[in-house]
Each structure stands twice: as structure tokens, then as C-alpha cells.
């Protein structure tokens, strides 16, 4: 690797460093589909942005392979714990890759927020945050799932969100 | 942009990379003012530091525009749920910018930790963590607010804190 | 520092930037020792990796001094709140340094998840996340501790984990 080659690589690195991949997607009314699919997100307006990553059907799509810190927060809330709602809520970040038909768990949390409400008419709130570093290849996708998504509370994009940046 | 220009930019970038903006501020006895203002923070002692960011009256002040991962954790605690205390606690990161005198919500969580205590004399603890990537212009400020701040428990700067770094 | 020197430093920086220190360690059946020591972690299989950091007896070991965003999540769970189990769970990141015999608290959370269960036979789940920027010198170590670790629930490395990356 001669000086010229190194120079080109450095120039290239400077340019790529300017767009270190990062994204922050926010919750919206359309986030909860009720279809059993992943949560959907606002990608452009408000606090949301995509820089060096793309988006498709709820998924952050990696364009540049590397290690990424991925994170998600969801705001949970309800009134008491109605029958038919799971007492355990699972919030997770999952990877979709062309090499496997099934989603792979990356980071997952289980919580029992309903149990906080001591009466059936008590309003309760809880929040679940996940974050961690994972390796992602170009073309791989990351999605957020919440089971039971009926307990996710959306407002103004600041309480439920999903993001990533290359480390 | 000739080689000399590129060289200067690369030298500049190397120098600026050495001080990628970052900060970690810690809770102290003076953090809770009771004035309705944001939480105040220790900026120098112990684990606290500022690197490429400044601080003013509870706010991290941005000196270099860019995308920042901002985060905060607060330690909550109490004995039962005394009357007069909100059953919902709101913990948020907010932006201040001169053009908009009202703070802008960036990342927010609501929790109902009191509900965990099954008797009025039961001691309870809970923790709220927020983190996400936002764009900040030079001169803009980020603050942390907790409502009701009377439930924030401070001890030695490790349980309640506030930080940021450029991504 | 002449051009040649700057060039060497830039080449060096480019190479080191390629391996910006990062790690993500995952929970495994062997994580909980019951010995009073820190949690142990998987470092290679599955989602776990080490890049520019090393590992020893539960600790991430720093090889390059700098500011690091360190994080950990633990999945907690149980059935009711059996006598003998602490009603408060402490989850923390601690630093070991040759200069001090005792571990130094870096980031800590206290939670009372048991209180969510309204009956003694109720299954409950909770999750604790910590993350923040700290300065670490070469040779210093970071560990995770949970008290009472009997409430930590391990499964497939996605629910309890520990990581870091240089900022």
C-alpha cells in the first residue's frame, strides 16, 4: 500500500467519516399495525432521520457492514390489567438476514408492568429501553417487536423510538 | 480541493477527532432545586467530565453542530406513595434553542413506580434510562427534567446522571 | 511534527479507527457463580465479540485508554417475592484499577421489581439497563454485579449482556 494508495484511503475515510451511519426513527399512530408484524416508524419528519442507513417496512436496513450500537425504547401504559392481555410484555430488537428464514433475537427485555397496578382501574405507565452493539452486514435488517403491542403508547415521537449508529 | 487542501482538512480532522465531543455529568445534592427548573449536575469532580461541550445552569451546551447520542438515568425511590405525589413520573431530555422559548421534547419516559409498593410503608426503588440520537446545532442546549423530582434519589453520582457524545 | 510525522500519525489513526475498541458480551448459564463475584460472560459465541478490548474473569479489560460508553442490561424475574430475597436489587458497573484495592462504582441502579407481584405465586419480569461514558486507562477493568443475582434470568444471551465502545 504505497503513499498514493494510503492517501486515497484517507481521503475516502474522511468522506465516509462525515457520514458515519446513524438513524433515529420515531413512533407514530401508524406504528402499531396489529398484524403481528414489527412496529413501523416515522423516518423523516420531526426528530426522525436516516444517515447512511435506509428503511423498509419497519426495518432499518444496513448499507455499510460494521458494528452498530442499536437501541429502542417503547412507552407502555394501560388501565389495570384487562383479561386477554399478557401479563408479560416482550420488547425486542431482531435481525433479518437473507441467509436465515427466521428473525434472530438480538436484544430482548421482558417486563410485567401490569402487576404494578393494585386495582383494576388504576392507570399505569412503564418504559422499556434496550441498547447494545451488534455486527450487521450490508443488506441485513433490524426490526422492533413488542408483544403485546396493544400496551404500547405513542405520542409525539419522543416516547417510543428506534435508532442505531456505527461504532 | 487540491492535495494541500485535503491535507489540511485531514490534519484538522485528526485533531478534531481527538476531541470528539463527549460529556458525562453526575447527580449531586444540589441537583434538585425544587424551583421547577431542570436538574443541575456536577461537571468536574469524580466521574464527571466535559470534552468539547460546555455546561450552563443544568444544560449541556453544544459547541460543534452534529448528531449526538444523548442519555440520562435517574434513580427513583420512596416509601409507599404519599398523597400529593404524582403516581406518574415523567423523565425527559429537552432542547432549548433561542428561537423557541419553550423547551422541545427530545426523549421522554413515563413510569408509575409507586404502584409497585403493595403497602403504604413499603420502600420502593426504580430507575429510568433514556438514550437516543438527536441533531444539535452549535449553541443549542439540552437539559434533564423529572416531574415529580421529589422522588429522585441522589447518591455519589452513580445512580443519576446525564451525558452525550457525538456519533 | 513535520509532514512525515503527521502522515505516520494519520496512517496510524486510520488503522486504529478500523478497530475502534468495542465489545458485546452475553449472558450464559455460567454467568451466575453464586460466589459473590461479578457476573461472568460469553465472549465469542453467538452475538458476543471483543474488538480492541480483552476479557478476564468477568471483566472487560481496557487496552487503549480513552472515554468509553459502557452498558449492561440484566433480565430479572421470579415468582412472587420469596422470603430471604432482597426486596431491592442493585445492578451496577464497577471499575477495578491497580491503584485502588476496592472496586469503584461507575453506574448503578436500584429496583424493587418484586413489589409488582400482587400475589405470592405471581410470575414477574423486569429489566434493568445502564449506560454511560467513563474514562478508562489501559489495564483497568470493568465488571457487572447484581445483588441479589438469584433473580437474574439468563436465556440465549439476548436478555442479559454487557458491552462497551470507545467514543
Amino acid at each position: 500500500d504505497g503513499p498514493a494508495g494510503s492517501w486515497e484511503q484517507l481521503i475516502q475515510e474522511r468522506r465516509s467519516h462525515e457520514v458515519n451511519p446513524a438513524a433515529h426513527l420515531t413512533g407514530a399512530n401508524s406504528s402499531l399495525t396489529g398484524s403481528g408484524g414489527p412496529l413501523l416508524w416515522e423516518t423523516q419528519l420531526g426528530l426522525a432521520f436516516l444517515r447512511g442507513l435506509s428503511y423498509h417496512d419497519g426495518a432499518l436496513v444496513v448499507t455499510k457492514a460494521g458494528y452498530y450500537y442499536i437501541y429502542s425504547k417503547v412507552q407502555l401504559g394501560g388501565v389495570g390489567c384487562p383479561l386477554g392481555l399478557a401479563s408479560t410484555i416482550t420488547h425486542g430488537l431482531y435481525k433479518r438476514t437473507p441467509r436465515y428464514p427466521e428473525e434472530l433475537e438480538l436484544l430482548v427485555s421482558q417486563q410485567s408492568p401490569c402487576g404494578r397496578a393494585t386495582s383494576s382501574s388504576r392507570v399505569w405507565w412503564d418504559s422499556s429501553f434496550l441498547g447494545g452493539v451488534v455486527h450487521l452486514e450490508a443488506g441485513e435488517k433490524v426490526v422492533v417487536r413488542v408483544l403485546d403491542e396493544r400496551l404500547v403508547r405513542l405520542r409525539d415521537g419522543t416516547r417510543s423510538y428506534f435508532g442505531a449508529f456505527m461504532v | 480541493d487540491g492535495p494541500a487542501g485535503s491535507w489540511e482538512q485531514l490534519i484538522q480532522e485528526r485533531r478534531s477527532h481527538e476531541v470528539n465531543p463527549a460529556a458525562h455529568l453526575t447527580g449531586a445534592n444540589s441537583s434538585l432545586t425544587g424551583s421547577g427548573g431542570p436538574l443541575l449536575w456536577e461537571t468536574q469532580l469524580g466521574l464527571a467530565f466535559l470534552r468539547g461541550l460546555s455546561y450552563h445552569d443544568g444544560a449541556l451546551v453544544v459547541t460543534k453542530a452534529g448528531y449526538y447520542y444523548i442519555y440520562s438515568k435517574v434513580q427513583l425511590g420512596g416509601v409507599g406513595c404519599p398523597l400529593g405525589l404524582a403516581s406518574t413520573i415523567t423523565h425527559g431530555l429537552y432542547k432549548r434553542t433561542p428561537r423557541y422559548p419553550e423547551e422541545l421534547e427530545l426523549l421522554v419516559s413515563q413510569q408509575s413506580p409507586c404502584g409497585r409498593a403493595t403497602s403504604s410503608s413499603r420502600v420502593w426503588w426504580d430507575s429510568s434510562f433514556l438514550g437516543g440520537v438527536v441533531h444539535l446545532e452549535a449553541g443549542e442546549k439540552v437539559v434533564v427534567r423529572v416531574l415529580d423530582e421529589r422522588l429522585v434519589r441522589l447518591r455519589d453520582g452513580t445512580r443519576s446522571y446525564f451525558g452525550a457524545f457525538m456519533v | 511534527d513535520g509532514p512525515a510525522g503527521s502522515w505516520e500519525q494519520l496512517i496510524q489513526e486510520r488503522r486504529s479507527h478500523e478497530v475502534n475498541p468495542a465489545a458485546h458480551l452475553t449472558g450464559a448459564n455460567s454467568s451466575l457463580t453464586g460466589s459473590g463475584g461479578p457476573l461472568l460472560w460469553e465472549t465469542q459465541l453467538g452475538l458476543a465479540f471483543l474488538r480492541g478490548l480483552s476479557y478476564h474473569d468477568g471483566a472487560l479489560v481496557v487496552t487503549k485508554a480513552g472515554y468509553y460508553y459502557i452498558y449492561s442490561k440484566v433480565q430479572l424475574g421470579g415468582v412472587g417475592c420469596p422470603l430471604g430475597l432482597a426486596s431491592t436489587i442493585t445492578h451496577g458497573l464497577y471499575k477495578r484499577t491497580p491503584r485502588y484495592p476496592e472496586e469503584l462504582e461507575l453506574l448503578v441502579s436500584q429496583q424493587s421489581p418484586c413489589g409488582r407481584a400482587t400475589s405470592s405465586s405471581r410470575v414477574w419480569w423486569d429489566s434493568s439497563f445502564l449506560g454511560g461514558v467513563v474514562h478508562l486507562e489501559a489495564g483497568e477493568k470493568v465488571v457487572v454485579r447484581v445483588l441479589d443475582e438469584r433473580l437474574v434470568r439468563l436465556r440465549d444471551g439476548t436478555r442479559s449482556y454487557f458491552g462497551a465502545f470507545m467514543v
Epitope: 399512530n29 401508524s30 416515522e42 423516518t43 405520542r155 | 453542530a65 | -
Partner: antibody
């Protein structure tokens, strides 16, 4: 301070195209969306579309889909709106406006485009 | 996306208060606290008056206030002055990266 300065008035013939520019200053150009809004004489404001200046993504109002193209030159901190197949009803003042969170602020001063044979 | 519904015109005498309504759906006005209001004098560019339903940018008189109930947002101007005579437009985020304007209201100060 934050400012948007648009190009001058244009007179075009039916069927022609017009390209209006909007130069930004006082903020990080690539970190915000830029919208284009038009207003025909005596009519309401009409949203045309936006461009994500950072990555070039665009979204257009269905009404203008296929006729409008929004681009940007990041090195010049300038956004452009090109409208083709001009008709007399396209006579309007065209505004650029920065998207700040979920509102428009500031706005350009406006560019009058007159379509006349 | 159809326009938000505003009255075509409202009027009031100096010193009075007037309210301009802006009705949408649960997908836009009702779904988010992201309603803003713009004032436009003849031949001038629109000016932001209210954002996030009820917040005022610096430099805007506190005679201007905003509120929302259900799918309807409102702009209230108290202590009406001659210089308030202008067109007023509401605007809302509508999800999925889309936005929508109101039809505009002409305010006449009698």
C-alpha cells in the same frame, strides 16, 4: 441568523419548465428537510413536496407527482424545485421552507413564476 | 391528503378576541400534538405564529395562543389590532412522512 434566499421572478411559456433555487445559511443545511409550497393568486397555500437534504430522499404531493423534481447541492447549501409541463394555472408564488421538527421555519421570500403565452 | 377545514373568513373589532378553528381527523390534528399556525400578509411570505399546538416562537406577541380539542385545533387572537389583519393557515403532521395545510382563513379587523 437562519435565512433562506430564493431566486428571482420568472416568466415561462406553457409547456416549459422552471427551476427555482433556495439558498440556505445560518444552520447545518444537511440536517433538515426542505419543503416547497406554492400559492396561486388569491388561493391557499399548497404543499408540493420535500427533500431530505442529508440523503436526497424526496416525497411529493400526489397532485404534482411526475411534474415536480426537488434536488439539492449540498456544497452550495442550495435546494432546487423544478416544475415541468407548465400550464397557466401554475402561475403562483413558490416558497421554500425549512422543516424544523414539525413546523416550517423560516420561509424563503418567495419566487413569482408567471406562465403566459 | 385533503386540506384541513378552516372557516373562509372571520372578523372582529379592535380590542376584541377571535378564534379560528382548524378541523382534521384522528390521522392528523387529532393524532399528534403537531399543529402549527402561520400568518400571511398580502405579498409576504408566511410567518410561524404557533407550533406544537400552543407554543409561541420568540418575537410573537402573547396575544396569540393555540389549543386543541379532539380533531380540532384553534388559534385565538386577543386584543385584536389592525396589524393582525391577514390570512391564517393551520398545518399538521399527518403520519408516514406526510403533512397537510388548512384552507386558510381571512381575518378582517373592522
Amino acid at each position: 441568523q437562519v435565512q433562506l434566499v430564493q431566486s428571482g421572478a420568472e416568466v415561462k411559456k406553457p409547456g416549459a419548465s422552471v427551476k427555482v433555487s433556495c439558498r440556505a445559511s445560518g444552520y447545518t443545511f444537511t440536517s433538515y428537510l426542505m419543503h416547497w409550497v406554492r400559492q396561486a393568486p388569491g388561493q391557499r397555500l399548497e404543499w408540493m413536496g420535500w427533500i431530505n437534504v442529508g440523503n436526497g430522499n424526496t416525497k411529493y404531493s400526489q397532485k404534482f407527482q411526475g411534474r415536480v423534481t426537488i434536488t439539492r447541492d449540498t456544497s452550495a447549501s442550495t435546494a432546487y424545485m423544478e416544475l415541468s409541463g407548465l400550464r397557466s394555472e401554475d402561475t403562483a408564488v413558490y416558497y421554500c421552507a425549512r422543516n424544523y421538527y414539525n413546523w416550517f421555519d423560516p420561509w424563503g421570500q418567495g419566487t413569482l413564476v408567471t406562465v403566459s403565452s | 391528503q385533503s386540506a384541513l377545514t378552516q372557516p373562509a373568513s372571520v372578523s372582529g373589532s379592535p380590542g376584541q378576541s377571535i378564534t379560528i378553528s382548524c378541523t382534521g381527523t384522528s390521522s392528523d390534528v387529532g393524532g399528534y400534538n403537531y399543529v402549527s399556525w402561520y400568518q400571511q400578509h398580502p405579498g409576504k411570505a408566511p410567518k410561524l405564529m404557533i407550533y406544537d399546538v400552543s407554543k409561541r416562537p420568540s418575537g410573537v406577541s402573547n396575544r396569540f395562543s393555540g389549543s386543541k380539542s379532539g380533531n380540532t385545533a384553534s388559534l385565538t387572537i386577543s386584543g385584536l389590532q389592525a396589524e393582525d389583519e391577514a390570512d391564517y393557515y393551520c398545518f399538521s403532521y399527518a403520519g408516514s412522512s406526510t403533512v397537510v395545510f388548512g384552507g386558510g382563513t381571512k381575518l378582517t379587523v373592522l
